[in-house]
Structures are given as structure tokens and as C-alpha cells.
């Protein structure tokens, strides 16, 4: 209708990076920019994704290098993390959130794809990492190895081999395991501290240089107490599980101190593994009963999990696997290991800014049934799995509903702000829920809408529209872009209107009648008034139309509702040659060229397109006759 198709600004970017997957208009003290997501962008050798800032009138885009942002204290994997897959602007302070839903970190032998987002302030500076699903690894452990180095240990090389082999089993790195070694005999010394080395390679190298210090006495109690009071302090981390491994070949010369030492270790929650090396006893034919009892006393209960004995130093190699496995069985002590909570949550798959924080869709949470998490300045709210049971029953728990595929919110005059989330795979047909979140990790689900057709992906895109700008939502639009009709993936957008606290179905938006795939409803944007009639409008993307070139449809708002017939259909081919997937993302909240009219930003594969609004001239015709 009044969007200019003759002189668009087509901003080029990398197709392989999928520059244009997301677009947002951005205002910094009057300077207008486009923020463009490129979730497959490369940074160095890694395909991290990234975000670009693009000047609106002329000039080149600049990469923000958010892909280089690193989280300390985790062993992160940023390759394929899809930074820029979702963008959310905060109009209050012009900051925005760029999410990497496939950001993952190493935990033991697993990679947990918790997702993370970067908050960027209004002048494009990174300000904060938002990662509400990130939990400490179960391998967040400080392990201190307490080695008996007294004269009776022989040959020392076997102890060294054992040490090296057990260290190779440890997941050493930021956010995971730290290892320190103390050696004792008559005295105790730090061989190295917990925070001296950050990789298996470095720790193994250091361990290979530990020499036997000797000593005629075996002060095991002192060794344990030294480890507890000093080794765990120097480089120890708050909240890390404390594990001690004691390796000795004889009764201690300070066993009367063991009671107090062990009590203090218990108080400090130190889990103790104890290894009795019987070489000295066996070589001399001595009964080891008293020694074994002492080592069992040192080991945490139950003994069968924490106590080991070997015939001699050479046999230490035989317990490496068992010891390693027992330590790592600490990981999921009370956990059903086949079930995932937030470990694979992919938080940030969708994002939406609300007054007190940000909502993040986490499609992979709770075994891919999905969840919505909220991060606020006061902390995070992570609803429990059980909170969703009313609308996501236990019997469908293995279906992978993908709740959080999209998130938004509505405002009703009675309930205030209510959150909305889509679960496009729920029971194969899709579902949308409207809910409020509580600080006790529960939800109140007010309403649910269900899709009609299997595989239609109902709820993969949701937009709330305040048509008249009074602060109360009038219309909720739900996309089902895979809706199959007349032999093609045509797509459908469902219209729900707010009537006394409930959204009531009121038909669908009309698309064009082409006979190709379209995926109408892949993106739906509530945009500010385009046609200057004081009603806000809606733009719907159909990125597969015209043989994957793409198209957008503009629907006008009118008196608290939306007109279901498009006022303008803009195809990619009208604008420029070679555009593909035009309409995969849409944003229209700002006047970008200072003409007083709201302009549109539309994403495509490798391009961002700005469409300028033209003024609407209203001609009121009146006839009067003279003489009357």
C-alpha cells in the first residue's frame, strides 16, 4: 500500500553466515542502525555466529564480535553456538540481547547445550552474559591427592605411573576438575596447588616430575589435615566438591590424631578415597589387618565405594579405572541419568524483553519438552518440570514439544502482563500457552490454544498486537508456517482477539494463492502504524514464496482488530535480484530516515532490506453545487 518497493536499501552480508536471519531496528541518541544476526558467522576457526551493526542510510556493516565473548570458569564450546539466532531489543534503554542457543560447555564426558545470551548496551558494547540455565558441572571438583612418600614406598615409579594414569582420567579444566598434590612422610609439602594447572596435559607433566621425598615416619593424619586446611584453601573454589585421595603403604605414626582429622574433614564435606598399598606388608610377611582398618577409617563411608587395597605398588595401575569411575559416580548421585533437566535446554532459542527482565525460550529443557526461563536483575526464575504438567501431561513427555520455540507477552486490563510461549511440536499439532510465572518456580497457565494439523508447527511464531496503542493487547497472532494445504507447505496465521481476559479465535489471515511452498507465518511482526491511520499494523513473512525468494504481507490494524486481507504484498523479486528467504525476519518500530514515517527492516538469506514508508495522502472529496 504505502511501502516503497522501488528504492529499498539492500544491505549485503554473508549468505553462508545467514546474515539477515534476524533483524532489529536500533536507535542510539538519534542515530539509526540495523542490528542483524548472522548465526552461522565464523570467528577464527569456529562457526560461532555473530551480530552486525549496519548504518541505515549508507556505509558498511560492522561485526560486533560477540562470538569472542567468553565465560570464565567453564570449558566452553562455541562452535555452532548460533549467536544471533534470536535478538530482543529493550526499547527502554535501547540495549539488546543476542542469544546463542547452542552454546555448550564441557561437563565430564558430555557437552551440555545450555545456551547463553549476551546483553549489549545502547552503544553496542557487550555488558553482560545471561545464562540462566548454566549450572555447575557435576565435575566441579577440587581433588587433592595425598601421597605417602616415605622410605617404605618402593618403587616410586609405580606410584608416579598410577598418579599420571589417574590424572588422565580427570576432566581438568575451567568449571570442572582442579587437582592438587601433597606428599607426606615426616613432613608435608605441596607438590602443586589446585589452581596451578588448567589442563590434563599440564598436570600430567607436573606429576611426572614429582620425586619421592622419603622419611622414616608416615604421618598420614598430618598429611590429611594439611590437605584439608591448606591444600583445599590454596586455589580451592567456593562450591566445588572436595575430594581427597590418600595413598599410603603403612600404619600412620600419628594415628591418634586421625579421629580429629577425619571429623574436621567430615565437617568440611571432604569425600575421602583411601588406597592401601600392601607391598611393604607382603614383602615382610606382616599381617596388615591393623593397617587396613586404619585405611578404612580414613576412607569415607561406605567403604566399598571409597576404600581400595592393592597387593603392591605395581598393582596400583589395576585400580585406576575403578577409582576414576567411583569419583565420577559422584556426578549424579541422586539423579536419574537418562533424564535431562536444563543440561540441553538451548536457552535463548527465543527471547523477549519484559519490564523486569527477559524471557528466554529453552526448547531443549526437560527432555526437549521445553520451558521458558526468566532472568531479572533480582535473579532467575526457572519453573520446575512439574509446573507445565497441566498442559504438557506426563504421557506425552517423550514427544519433544519444544515449548519456548517462541516467547512473547500480552497485557490484559484484568491480569496485567501475561507471558505467551509456543510449543510447535506438542502432540504433533502444536500448542500455545498463556501463563504467569512465580518466584517459587511454579506457573499459572491461564489459557492454551492447540493447533489443528499434524506437523503444521502451530506456535512456532507468536506476536501480540496492541492495535490502538492503549497499552492493552488486542490481538494475538499465532503462526503455523508448515500448515499443509492444497499440496503445499502454505502456512497459516491464526487470529485471536482479547475478550474479557481470554483470547478468542477469530479466523486467519489471508495469503496469496500461489501453488508453491510459502511458509506464510514464519515470521510475524507487530509494527507501528505504517499507513498513518493511528492503528498499529502487522507484517507477515512467507520466506519460501516465489521459489524461495520470499515475500511479506502487510495487514492493517483497524478498531481493535486486524484486517484479514493484506493491504500490500511485497515480493523479493520486486526489490532486487537474487534475494532469497526474504521475510525470514521482520522488525518495524522506528522511523529510520527522519521523515516521520515508520520504516520496515526485513531479513533475507545474506541480506537485510530496509523498506521506506511513503506518506499517505488522504483526499476527502466533497461536491457542492452553485447555485444550490
Amino acid at each position: 500500500f504505502n511501502m516503497d518497493t522501488r528504492k529499498p536499501r539492500v544491505i549485503p552480508g554473508s549468505r553462508t553466515a545467514f546474515f539477515g536471519y534476524t533483524v532489529q531496528q536500533h536507535d542510539i541518541s538519534g542515530n539509526k542502525w540495523l542490528v542483524v544476526g548472522a548465526p552461522l558467522e565464523t570467528n577464527g576457526y569456529q562457526k560461532t555466529g555473530d551480530v552486525y551493526k549496519c548504518p541505515v542510510i549508507h556505509g558498511n556493516c560492522t561485526k560486533l564480535n560477540l562470538g569472542r565473548v567468553t565465560l570464565s570458569n567453564v570449558s566452553e564450546r562455541k562452535d555452532n553456538m548460533r549467536l544471533g539466532l534470536s535478538l530482543a531489543t529493550n526499547p527502554k534503554d535501547n540495549s539488546f540481547l543476542a542469544c546463542s542457543p547452542l552454546w555448550s560447555h564441557e561437563c565430564g564426558s558430555s557437552y551440555y547445550t545450555t545456551g547463553m545470551c549476551s546483553r549489549v548496551n545502547s552503544n553496542f558494547r557487550f555488558s553482560k552474559t545471561v545464562a540462566p540455565a548454566l549450572q555447575r558441572c557435576q565435575t566441579y571438583m577440587d581433588i587433592v591427592i595425598v601421597l605417602d612418600g616415605s622410605n617404605s614406598i618402593y618403587p616410586w615409579v609405580e606410584v608416579q605411573h598410577f598418579l599420571i594414569n589417574i590424572l588422565k582420567k580427570f576432566y581438568i579444566g575451567p568449571g570442572q576438575i582442579q587437582v592438587g598434590v601433597v606428599q607426606y612422610g615426616e613432613d608435608v609439602v605441596h607438590e602443586f596447588h589446585l589452581n596451578d594447572y588448567r589442563s590434563v596435559k599440564d598436570v600430567v607433566e607436573a606429576a611426572s616430575h614429582i620425586e619421592q621425598r622419603g622419611g622414616t615416619e608416615t604421618r598420614t593424619a598430618f598429611g590429611i589435615e594439611f590437605a584439608r586446611s591448606e591444600a583445599f584453601q590454596k586455589g580451592g573454589r567456593k562450591g566445588a566438591k572436595k575430594v581427597m585421595i590418600v595413598i599410603t603403604d603403612g600404619e600412620s605414626h600419628d594415628s591418634p590424631d586421625l579421629e580429629k582429622v577425619i571429623q574436621q574433614s567430615e565437617r568440611d564435606n571432604v569425600t575421602r578415597y583411601a588406597v592401601a598399598v600392601l607391598g611393604y606388608y607382603n614383602r615382610r610377611g606382616i599381617n596388615p589387618e591393623t593397617f587396613l582398618n586404619e585405611i578404612k577409617y580414613i576412607a569415607s563411608d561406605p567403604d566399598d565405594k571409597h576404600f581400595f587395597n592393592v597387593t603392591d605398588e605395581a598393582a596400583l595401575k589395576d585400580i585406576v579405572d575403578a577409582l576414576g569411575d567411583r569419583i565420577f559416580s559422584l556426578e549424579g548421585t541422586n539423579k536419574n541419568e537418562t533424564s535431562f533437566g536444563l543440561e540441553m535446554s538451548q536457552t535463548g532459542f527465543s527471547s523477549h524483553v519484559v519490564e523486569d527482565g527477559v524471557l528466554l525460550g529453552a526448547v531443549g529443557a526437560y527432555d526437549w519438552n521445553g520451558a521458558v526461563l526468566k532472568e531479572t536483575s533480582a535473579g532467575k526464575v526457572i519453573p520446575l518440570r512439574e509446573s507445565y504438567l497441566k498442559e504438557f501431561p506426563e504421557e506425552l513427555k517423550n514427544h519433544g514439544a519444544y515449548l519456548g520455540y517462541t516467547v512473547t507477552s500480552v497485557v490484559s486490563s484484568r491480569q496485567g502482563r501475561v507471558y505467551v510461549a509456543g510449543a510447535p511440536r506438542f502432540n504433533h499439532t502444536g500448542k500455545v500457552i498463556l501463563f504467569t510465572m512465580h518466584n517459587n518456580r511454579s506457573l499459572t497457565i491461564h489459557q492454551a490454544m492447540r493447533g489443528q494439523q499434524i506437523g503444521s508447527y502451530f506456535g512456532s511464531e507468536i506476536t501480540s498486537v496492541d492495535i490502538d496503542g492503549d497499552g492493552v493487547t488486542d490481538v494475538l497472532l499465532v503462526g503455523a508456517p508448515m500448515y499443509f494445504n492444497e499440496g503445499r507447505e502454505r502456512g497459516k496465521v491464526y487470529v485471536y482477539e482479547l475478550r474479557q481476559n481470554l483470547f478468542v479465535y477469530n479466523g486467519t489471515l489471508k495469503d496469496s494463492h500461489s501453488y508453491q511452498n510459502a511458509r506464510f507465518g514464519s515470521s510475524i511482526a507487530s509494527v507501528r502504524d505504517l499507513n498513518q491511520d493511528s492503528y498499529n499494523d502487522v507484517v507477515v513473512g512467507a520466506p519460501l514464496e516465489d521459489n524461495h525468494a520470499g515475500a511479506i504481507y502487510i495487514f492493517h490494524g483497524f478498531r481493535g482488530s486486524i484486517l484479514k486481507t493484506p493491504k500490500q504484498r511485497i515480493t523479493a523479486s520486486e526489490l532486487a535480484t537474487g534475494l532469497q528467504y526474504f521475510g525470514c525476519s521482520i522488525h518495524g518500530q522506528l522511523d529510520l530516515n527522519e521523515d516521520g514515517l515508520i520504516d520496515l527492516a526485513v531479513g533475507a538469506l545474506g541480506n537485510a532490506v530496509i523498506l521506506w514508508s511513503r506518506p499517505v495522502v488522504q483526499i476527502n472529496a466533497s461536491l457542492h453545487f452553485e447555485p444550490s
Partner: antibody
């Protein structure tokens, strides 16, 4: 030759204090434990307190807890028993004895004893 | 706390007699039980450690044994210098808390 010599005993009024010393020679206090054991006139042996000179861990009999303090000065190779708030029932001969690994945690050497009399 | 109950509290015997003194622990204990001999006006002397090991310099007529929670000191052939008071002593495992028995006075018959 291993030797333990107690000193510091004497007559003291109820509520008073006394400090007993146990000077060790012929071995290093650092690698052993010292126990104080007492024997009231005509009675059996009663364990009083112990200290690990190395770790400074201490143990006390319930009857003296809070009143007696055991300590050691490894540089002087001497152990001490500080006795406060003394009562008539604390009257006894006080022995110090060595306790260590090599005698399988038995008291292998004893001092000659020092008499403490608590009386008004 | 572990109690050591020593019996008898006294006994009369003649030179050459076999004498047996018993200590019963109130609960299961380690073998860290020792026996001491004390003569009037003198400090106690160690005879037996670890329930059955003879301390150096102690005559072989002294022996110790264990049966469950019962510990026994045996003098195979009583000698004139053996008339004294005998004490058992138990060490609490992994602490330096110790307990003595009440003592057994061996007198000349």
C-alpha cells in the same frame, strides 16, 4: 637414654592453680604423644590428658575438662599441665608418660611422678 | 566411652603359681591393650602391648592374650619380684583417649 622428669607439684589451696612440667630427654617430643596420668593416694591409675606435640591436638578426661590445659614446647622438649580451679579430689601423684607408634600406642616410659596436694 | 573391667581386684598366690588376670572391654575394641606393673611408690612399667606382645626387657613368664572383648595377663610362674599391682589399659582407636582398669593387687599367700 629415654627419661621423663616431672616437676611443679606441691601444696595448693582449693580453687588455686599449679603448673606441672614434664622434661623429656633421650627422644624428640616432636614425634610422640605425652599423657598425664594421676594416682590418688591408695587408688588406681586415672588418665588425665594427652597431647600430640606435632599437631597440638589435645584430649582430656571429663573430670578435668575446662580446668586443666595440656601443652608442649618442642623447642624445650617439655610438656606442661596447667591446673586451675583445683579441688581436693585432684590430690594425687601426677605422672607423665610417652605414648607412640613404636610401642603400639602403649605408655612405654613414665616419669617418677610429682605429688599435688589440694588442701586448705 | 569404653570401660575396662578388671578382675579380680586382688588375689593371693604363692611363688611358682600360675596367675591369670582378666580385663573385659565394655564394647568391641582394637588390640591396642597394654598391661602395666606398679610397685608401691614407683611409676608403672609396661609389660605387654598390642594385647599379646612382650615389651623388651620383660621376662617371658609374662604373656598376654585376647578372646573377643576379654584380655588376659598370665604370669606362668609367679616370682617374688612379681608381687605388685597390675593394670590393663585400652587405647581408643584413632584418638589418644585411654582408659585404665581398676587394677589387680597380687599379694603373697
Amino acid at each position: 637414654e629415654v627419661q621423663l622428669v616431672e616437676s611443679g607439684g606441691g601444696l595448693v589451696q582449693p580453687g588455686g592453680s599449679l603448673r606441672l612440667s614434664c622434661a623429656a630427654s633421650g627422644f624428640n617430643l616432636y614425634s610422640s604423644y605425652i599423657h598425664w596420668v594421676r594416682q590418688a593416694p591408695g587408688k588406681g591409675l586415672e588418665w588425665v590428658a594427652s597431647i600430640s606435640s606435632y599437631s597440638s591436638y589435645t584430649y582430656y578426661a571429663d573430670s578435668v575438662k575446662g580446668r586443666f590445659t595440656i601443652s608442649a614446647d618442642t623447642s624445650k622438649n617439655t610438656a606442661y599441665l596447667q591446673m586451675n580451679s583445683l579441688r581436693a579430689e585432684d590430690t594425687a601423684v601426677y605422672y607423665c608418660a610417652r605414648y607412640w607408634y613404636h610401642s603400639a600406642w602403649a605408655l612405654d616410659y613414665w616419669g617418677q611422678g610429682t605429688l599435688v596436694t589440694v588442701s586448705s | 566411652d569404653i570401660q575396662m573391667t578388671q578382675s579380680p581386684s586382688s588375689l593371693s598366690a604363692s611363688v611358682g603359681d600360675r596367675v591369670t588376670i582378666t580385663c573385659r572391654a565394655s564394647q568391641s575394641v582394637s588390640s591396642a591393650v597394654a598391661w602395666y606393673q606398679q610397685k608401691p611408690g614407683k611409676a608403672p612399667k609396661l609389660l605387654i602391648y598390642s594385647a599379646s606382645s612382650l615389651y623388651s626387657g620383660v621376662p617371658s613368664r609374662f604373656s598376654g592374650s585376647r578372646s573377643g572383648t576379654d584380655f588376659t595377663l598370665t604370669i606362668s610362674s609367679l616370682q617374688p619380684e612379681d608381687f605388685a599391682t597390675y593394670y590393663c589399659q585400652q587405647s581408643a582407636p584413632y584418638s589418644s583417649l585411654i582408659t585404665f582398669g581398676q587394677g589387680t593387687k597380687v599379694e603373697i599367700k
